[in-house]
């Protein structure tokens, strides 16, 4: 017996040869002898199956002795054995009718699970084999489950069914609902200009939801809400501004903030948060600001960081073309007595400067 | 054709009220964030007011705002702005606009309406 | 509100001649920008949005570049119909605002 796998959804064609190159009487019928289709002369007859109105043949083949049996729109249920009668002979397939599934939607935020659900006949045995947009094999019976989806796992997973040796594929695609970063870090010398952006990984035609930026500066005790805003159509419209720091907010996506100056009081990190409607969980992305000032007191050139600085950054003082008078792995550094000249304070990480700032010492006289 | 055209606009002694209508044509009006954007004679353009196009939030620049109300009528077609309390400050030509599929500027304009605030 | 800065008011040219005009915002805009054209007892008419791209119908003797808060509008050969008024218009967020205007006149 020949078998056939089928897709939920899709049209197949089963066939059916005759041994003469011309139309002559045939019948397809089920496991139960439900005629579905034949022909009188020239004509489609169809009989009283389930099938009536998703089963068609080509009429054009009848003149070479082919007779297929097309069934569109598969369901599982139309799994069976189909007999093809034709020259006082039998032709029987066997047809398997599979279909998977995402558990709720294609759409999940980044870190939570996808589930794939295989529907298949009963009787049947399948095994599952998935691969996701970044080449990862997973396998499984009815059911494969895959926890924390990461923004990779964005895109066509392809899945092979496989039974009686024979396979089918299914494409499925995911939509792993993040930022493009999870986190981000902005230097700026004090007084500068501040923009954070929140680009999307995603694209969708509507986009609606909430956010909030909570802030925690590093002077600060405890966190306090920078803004507000809600997300509608992919405009974004602010609902609550804190007015220290009096933020500016872009009215399109990619969400887009500016601070109008960096000030030590500001510097620390962020966390912008945003819910989207009709799904459970929050996007997250995490951003920080660190905030250099070189100053000259006196007899005292003291240059100095705020925020949140990994212990491997080197902070140093040095005078303009020449060696570095100060370098340390600190928050802070200073010169006494500075000479005149231009001086560079700079925050670098392995020797890739990251931040610098320039300040003038005056002769004295 | 995408078309506005706006009406309304006349002389009005100061204190008095005003209101302007755009009627919009040949595209999904309700779609579309819309403007109002005036010019005083021998001046340049200056935005008045804004209303989106999903949210219908309303927006004014602090020269107008308190005074000066947006609305849209759907059924309609009609962008209006209601002017209250007018001054001679207020005396323009005011410009209805729509603004571009995911704003993309303001790529439509009316041929204008005049007001004129003096007693 | 975001102040826009236009510059310069006014400038004399001659036909053929490459003319920029500047445009700086007080805060950082991205590329939320657009240059409109103006002739008298006409209404604006829109240039350049996303403070790069060429609105549809606009001869391509037009360009505008920028983001942040420095933005740029070049006509590169200039033509008889350019001697207008053009302005740029932030549409960060609202209130939007406008630029000065700048009169370009034939000399």
């Known amino acids: 017996k020949k078998v056939v796998l089928g897709k939920k959804g899709d049209t197949v064609e089963l066939t059916c040869t005759a041994s003469q190159k011309k139309s002559i009487q045939f019948h397809w019928k089920n496991s139960n002898q439900i005629k579905i289709l034949g022909n009188q002369g020239s004509f489609l007859t169809k009989g009283p199956s389930k099938l009536n109105d998703r089963a068609d043949s080509r009429r054009s083949l009848w003149d070479q002795g082919n007779f297929p049996l097309i069934i569109k729109n598969l369901k599982i249920e139309d799994s069976d054995t189909y007999i093809c009668e034709v020259e006082d002979q039998k032709e029987e397939v066997q047809l398997l009718v599979f279909g998977l599934t995402a558990n709720s939607d294609t759409h999940l935020l980044q870190g939570q699970s996808l589930t794939l659900t295989l529907e298949s006949p009963p009787g049947s045995s399948p095994s599952v084999q998935c691969r996701s947009p970044r080449g990862k094999n997973i396998q499984g019976g009815k059911t494969l489950s895959v926890s924390q989806l990461e923004l990779q796992d964005s895109g066509t997973w392809t899945c092979t069914v496989l039974q009686n040796q024979k396979k089918v594929e299914f494409k499925i695609d995911i939509v792993v609902l993040a930022f493009q970063k999870a986190s981000s870090i902005v230097y700026k010398k004090e007084g500068e200009q501040v923009e954070f952006s929140f680009p999307l990984a995603f694209t969708v035609e509507k986009l609606t939801g909430s956010g909030e930026l909570w802030w925690q500066a590093e002077r600060a005790s405890s966190s306090k809400s920078w803004i507000t805003f809600d997300l509608k159509n992919k405009e974004v419209s602010v609902k609550r501004v804190t007015q220290d720091p009096k933020l500016q907010m872009g009215k399109k996506l990619p969400l887009h903030l500016t601070l109008p100056q960096a000030l030590p009081q500001y510097a620390g990190s962020g966390n912008l948060t945003l819910a989207l409607e009709a799904k459970t969980g929050k996007l997250h992305q995490e951003v920080n600001l660190v905030v250099m000032r070189a100053t000259q007191l006196q007899k005292n050139l003291t240059c100095e960081v705020w925020g949140p600085t990994s212990p491997k950054l080197m902070l140093s003082l040095k005078l303009e073309n020449k060696e570095a008078k100060v370098s340390k792995r600190e928050k802070a550094v200073w010169v006494l007595n500075p000479e005149a000249g231009m001086w560079q304070c700079l925050l670098s990480d392995s020797g890739q400067v990251l931040l610098e700032s320039n300040i003038k010492v005056l002769p004295t006289w | 054709e995408v078309q506005l055209l706006e009406s309304g606009g006349g002389l009005v002694q100061p204190g008095g009220s005003l209101r302007l209508s755009c009627a919009a044509s040949?595209?999904?009006?309700?779609?579309?964030?819309m403007s109002w954007v005036r010019q005083a004679p021998g001046k340049g353009l200056e935005w008045v007011s804004g209303?989106?196009?999903?949210?219908?939030?309303?927006y004014y620049a602090d020269s107008v705002k308190g005074r000066f109300t947006i609305s849209r009528d759907k059924s309609k077609n009609t962008l209006y702005l209601q002017m209250n309390s007018l001054r001679a400050e207020d005396t323009a030509v005011y410009y209805c606009?729509?603004?571009?599929?995911?704003?993309?500027?303001?790529?439509?304009w009316g041929k204008g309406t005049t007001v004129t605030v003096s007693s | 509100a975001i102040q826009m800065t236009q510059s310069p008011s006014s400038l004399s040219a001659f036909v053929g001649d490459r003319v920029t005009i500047t445009c700086r915002a007080s805060?950082?805009?991205?590329?939320?920008l657009g240059w409109y054209q103006q002739k008298p007892g006409k209404a604006p008419k829109l240039l350049i949005y996303?403070?790069?791209s060429l609105q549809s119908g606009v001869p391509s003797r037009f360009s505008g570049s920028g983001s942040g808060t420095d933005f740029t509008l070049t006509i590169s050969s200039l033509q008889p119909e350019d001697f207008a008024t053009y302005y740029c218009?932030?549409?960060?967020?609202?209130?939007?605002?406008f630029g000065q205007g700048t009169k370009l006149e034939i000399k």
């Open positions: 606009a729509k603004e571009g599929y995911d704003w993309s500027g303001m790529d439509v």
């Open positions: 040949g595209f999904t009006f309700s779609s579309y964030a």
């Open positions: 209303i989106s196009g999903s949210v219908g939030s309303t």
């Open positions: 805060q950082g805009i991205r590329n939320d």
């Open positions: 996303a403070a790069s």
């Open positions: 218009l932030q549409d960060y967020n609202y209130p939007y605002t």
